[in-house]
Interface confidence: low
């Protein structure tokens, strides 16, 4: 996961929407108790914005200490600030908790930019606007960090919702959601609706604004329109999925689909941008530039370094193309596509010098670690992390930003052959050979 701010090919047979209709798997299937319906107490329990992350209120310790915690599907540690830091309004004070248990083990987590380190322990944890349960969970008490906490973000810790395989220091450290499911009757599933504002928020507006919802243990029908379409979780480490085709304004990028998933494709709420492998990024930018060629933008804009501004209310959304990612479906040879608008991939930012203008950063960037479907993608959709069935669902979010001409979309099915070949197999070190 990265904050503001996350490593021989065959020619593809496919991805073309041939028009053949296949039976689809959506949410129109037998209901299970607790999995579907209304979760009023959890709706609107997130705050924040895509550039600084979305956070949920949690309590740790006895008596409970309230903290705001970044929701991160791209990591697997529950880690909270546990020492004074200039960017933290509050922090976890272990000495004040009668239920804290020290594991006497350190943890060090480096990111591409930044790092944190801390001390492992367990304590009682609950989510006030979540299921009415308390669990004993692993907590990394962050004692030192560098470029991790964000000034003004209003969160004091991170909730890693991915799988144990990527937990630090190793996969023996049970992630929070695993503990929650093991210790309670909460179903093994959560869903996220991240609501981009569509305009820059100042500090007071962030504190007052609704950022979205994390529904723990179920799906709330009020948060999406249309149908949910599911893609398999390829491997339980990150939330890894397979992209089988990419289109810019309906034009196929025509790349070997392995390139789209080199070396993986993940869904990561803790990353701001849509991050694409180098070759894919270059092809996508070339295509987006061509589509929006009625206006010229500096190179720094396409690199995500420079803002572009328009007079308030005059952003020419129509000159920017829609982007479609086709994801492997649950049925053999079936895919579906998710389509985002420039309202998702142009991120509104405050420009103090021109506060009467609407300014944006290009929120698609280059990655050396595969495709990362970050907040700018997720803000278009209601995303269901159905861990029990090893799949991720997408539906059009009821809160996504759009205009009168275009809307984000989730559509299918499409016939796509040989989708398994789109997955990249990361070379595994054969550890047994190292033992000899």
């Amino acid at each position: 996961t990265q904050h503001g701010i996350r490593l021989p090919l065959r020619s593809g047979l496919g991805g073309a929407p041939l028009g053949l209709r296949l039976p689809r798997e959506t949410d129109e299937e037998p209901e299970e108790p607790g999995r579907r319906g209304s979760f009023v107490e959890m709706v609107d329990n997130l705050r924040g914005k895509s550039g600084q992350g979305y956070y949920v209120e949690m309590t740790v310790g006895s008596p409970p200490q309230t903290l705001n915690i970044l929701v991160d599907t791209g990591s697997s540690n529950f880690a909270v600030g546990a020492a004074p830091h200039p960017f933290l309004h509050r922090y976890y004070q272990r000495q004040l908790s009668s239920t804290y248990r020290d594991l006497r083990k350190g943890v060090y987590v480096p990111y591409t930019q930044g790092k944190w380190e801390g001390e492992l322990g367990t304590d009682l944890v609950s989510i006030p606007h979540g299921p009415n349960v308390t669990v004993r969970a692993n907590i990394a008490a962050i004692t030192e960090s560098d470029k991790f906490f964000i000034n003004g973000s209003n969160w004091e810790g991170i909730l890693g919702l991915a799988y144990a395989e990527i937990a630090r220091p190793d996969d023996s450290l049970e992630p929070f959601f695993d503990s929650l499911v093991k210790q309670t009757h909460v179903p093994n599933l959560f869903s996220l609706q991240l609501c981009g504002a569509g305009f820059p928020l100042n500090q007071s507006e962030v504190l007052a604004s609704v950022g979205g919802s994390m529904i723990i243990g179920g799906i709330d029908h009020s948060l999406y329109t249309g149908s949910l379409w599911y893609t398999p979780i390829r491997r339980e480490w990150y939330y890894e999925v397979i992209i089988v085709r990419v289109e810019i304004n309906g034009q196929d990028l025509k790349m070997d689909c392995k390139e789209y998933n080199y070396d993986k494709s993940i869904v990561d709420s803790g990353t701001t941008n849509l991050r694409l492998p180098k070759k894919v990024f270059e092809a996508a930018v070339k295509s987006i530039k061509a589509a929006s060629s009625t206006e010229k933008f500096p190179d720094g804009f396409w690199l995500g370094e420079q803002l572009v501004c328009w007079q308030a209310g005059t952003t020419p959304w129509n000159i920017f193309p829609v982007i479609s990612l086709y994801l492997m479906g649950e049925v053999t040879n079936q895919s579906f596509r998710i389509t985002i608008l420039p309202q998702q991939y142009l991120r509104p930012v405050e420009d103090v010098a021109t506060s009467q203008d609407d300014c944006y950063k290009f929120a698609i960037s280059q990655s050396s670690t595969g495709t990362v479907m970050g907040a700018v993608i997720m803000e278009g959709f209601y995303v269901v992390f159905d861990r029990a069935r090893k799949r991720i669902g997408f539906a059009v979010s009821a809160c996504h930003v759009h205009d009168e001409f275009r809307t984000a979309a989730v559509e299918g099915p499409f016939v796509t052959l040989d989708m398994e070949d789109c997955g990249y197999n990361i070379p595994q070190t054969d550890e047994s050979t190292l033992m000899t």
């Epitope: 830091h85 200039p86 030192e144 960090s145 560098d146 000034n151």
Partner: antibody
Framework: EVQLQQSGADLMKPGASVKLSCKAT????????IEWVKQRPGHGLEWIGE????????NYNEKFKGKATFTADTSSNTAYMQLSSLTTEDSAIYYC????????????WGQGTTLTVSS | DIVLSQSHKFMSTSVGDRVSITCKAS??????VAWYQQKPGQSPKALIY???NRHTGVPDRFTGSGSGTDFTLTISNVQSEDLAEYFC?????????FGGGTRLEIK
């Protein structure tokens, strides 16, 4: 008390290499970065780079890549900077400094090593 | 690289006065700025980090302020021992860079 003790002054010939040392005491050596800074009269302070002894992670100023190499010996709590292919431009005072992992500023400095390169 | 400009190479003040030393960054560095004091023949000493936080043991007459591109180190009630050169540093992005220094002279 945090202390960074640097090696003594050196007089070197152009083309030679030199290894400067910085011994840390009074804190956990592996929990902080060691910064290296160059100071020449009229040139102010220049950041050369840093090493994190806990993981031997390094960051170099592009300008000094190929010129400076950082190492650290955690058994003796000593950081080293090797300067290669010396020229008169390398004549300066070199400082090591400690930097907290969570702030990046140089909170404690060594006394400096004066390097003179002359034929 | 980010350039830090300290517009005054020298500043002259009297004991008991208040003096402000400025530092301007060529681009936004947030609050990732530190100030150092270097007395003649000595190594630099940390005064301020994160633009406004005093380093341990630094007298409260030293105050840092600013964010983005404009930063100020203010010394109120200047003492004779404050005769030194003062440097700003940004650590928002690599390579970290320093200002050219401002030498404070006591009248």
């Amino acid at each position: 008390e945090v202390q960074l003790q640097q090696s003594g002054a050196d007089l070197m010939k152009p083309g030679a290499s030199v290894k400067l040392s910085c011994k840390a005491t009074g804190y956990t050596f592996t929990g902080y970065w060691i910064e290296w800074v160059k100071q020449r009269p009229g040139h102010g302070l220049e950041w050369i780079g840093e090493i994190f002894p806990g993981s031997v992670s390094t960051n170099y100023n592009e300008k000094f890549k190929g010129k400076a190499t950082f190492t650290a010996d955690t058994s003796s709590n000593t950081a080293y900077m090797q300067l290669s292919s010396l020229t008169t431009e390398d004549s300066a005072i070199y400082y090591c400094a400690r930097s907290p992992i969570y702030y990046d500023y140089a909170d404690y400095w060594g006394q400096g090593t004066t390097l003179t390169v002359s034929s | 690289d980010i350039v830090l400009s300290q517009s005054h190479k020298f500043m002259s003040t009297s004991v008991g006065d208040r003096v402000s030393i400025t530092c301007k960054a060529s681009q936004d560095v947030g609050t990732a700025v530190a100030w150092y004091q270097q007395k003649p023949g000595q190594s630099p000493k940390a005064l301020i980090y994160l633009a406004s936080n005093r380093h341990t043991g630094v007298p409260d007459r030293f105050t840092g302020s600013g964010s983005g591109t404009d930063f100020t180190l203010t010394i109120s009630n200047v003492q004779s021992e404050d005769l030194a050169e003062y440097f700003c540093q940004q650590y928002n992005s690599y390579p970290y860079t320093f200002g050219g220094g401002t030498r404070l002279e006591i009248k």
